[in-house]
């Protein structure tokens, strides 16, 4: 049974040039994670392995981070960036949890920084 | 240039152990992901785990009970043990190079294959 | 586990045609798609990875594209050098999966 919840960022904005961290944060469950897969839409924007470390899709390489943690930094935002992002984990023997977050890109200086709330500080063994 | 080198014996018994070794030249195994996969007559292609330049494993469900992979850092090599083989392991078997920052799952070096068949 | 699916296991074609082999997911793996080609006697050669970007030293006439669920893999202009076996594979997640194959035969 499936007993895991994923904390997100929720929806957030961020001004256009600027950069913004995607977080999520899986609790209420013992499963190991085995991966993280950052996506937009049909896009693959970056896998966390456990094992193996961070992949960044060679679309993005240049302006996508690995991190905090298994978060995703997104940098150089444009107006284009606006949209829904989801941290799809891999888990063992639960299976996959996915978490939203929405993103808008804003033109002028109004853009709210972070998150609604603070996403605890997770700690990833091996 | 990243060289890989498959040996072992080619012929194994039903119920016997099968092991393997990878021998790796110009580059080390304490970087980058270690994988053994599997071409059976017919074409079908299995990818069966890998060793991670830390050391950890990770290997295809479909194989967990029977699969050991391991290494020797300072021989530069890497090994296979499959348990309990049965006929349905008959197969070429790879070892290959993984560059996961920069390819993902994708296998960039492949060894030559050696052919091993499970015949009692 | 994903099935890779390629519903042409033998594709017979001439030099100087374009010819395209296709691989269905059984379920969405966004970009994660790489294509091998396999000659015989040769262990399997990476042409392309992420679905569309090739590998170094892979001559231009071969493209990968799609994503989602479809994936196709083209050669634009066949050389009698391209028969091969050519198989598509999954890395969105383990266990990473390849699909049957696809046999380019040259006329």
């Known amino acids: 049974m499936m007993t895991g919840t994923i904390e997100t960022t929720g929806n957030i904005s961020a001004e256009k040039g600027g950069s913004i961290i995607l977080q999520c944060h899986l609790s209420s469950t013992t499963a190991q994670v085995t991966q993280v897969n950052w996506e937009q839409q049909d896009q693959l924007l970056a896998i966390c392995n456990a094992d193996l470390g961070w992949h960044i899709s060679p679309s993005f390489k240049d302006r996508v981070a690995p991190g905090p943690g298994l978060g995703l930094t997104l940098q150089s935002l444009t107006v284009n960036d606006t949209g829904e992002y989801f941290c799809i984990y891999h888990t063992y023997p639960d299976g996959t949890y996915t978490g939203r977050i929405f993103l808008e890109v804003l033109e002028s200086s109004v853009a709210e920084h972070g998150a609604r709330f603070q996403i605890p500080h997770h700690h990833h063994h091996h | 240039e990243v060289q890989l080198q498959e040996s072992g014996p080619g012929l194994a018994k039903p119920s016997q152990t099968l092991s393997l070794a990878c021998s790796v030249t110009g580059y080390s195994i304490t970087s980058d992901s270690w994988n053994w996969i599997r071409k059976f007559p017919g074409n079908k292609l299995e990818y069966m785990g890998y060793?991670?330049?830390?050391?950890?494993?990770y290997y295809n469900p479909s194989l967990k009970s029977r699969i050991s992979i391991t290494r020797d850092t300072s021989k530069n090599q890497f090994y296979l043990q499959l348990n309990s083989v049965t006929t349905e392991d008959t197969a070429t078997y790879y070892c290959a190079r993984l560059d996961f920052s920069n390819y993902g799952g994708a296998v960039d070096y492949w060894g030559q294959g050696t052919s091993v068949t499970v015949s009692s | 586990d994903i099935v890779m699916t390629q519903s042409h296991t033998f594709m017979s074609t001439s030099v100087g045609d374009r010819v395209s082999i296709t691989c269905k997911a059984s379920?969405?793996?966004?970009?994660?798609v790489a294509w091998y080609q396999q000659k015989p006697g040769q262990s399997p050669k990476l042409m392309i990875y992420s679905a569309s970007y090739r590998y170094t030293g892979v001559p231009d006439r071969f493209t990968g594209s799609g994503s989602g669920t479809d994936f196709t893999f083209t050669i634009s202009s066949v050389q009698a050098e391209d028969l091969a076996v050519y198989y598509c594979?999954?890395?969105?997640?383990?266990?990473?999966?390849f699909g049957g194959g696809a046999k380019l035969e040259i006329q």
């Open positions: 594979q999954q890395y969105y997640t383990t266990p990473w999966t």
């Open positions: 379920q969405n793996v966004r970009t994660a």
């Open positions: 060793i991670s330049y830390s050391g950890n494993t």
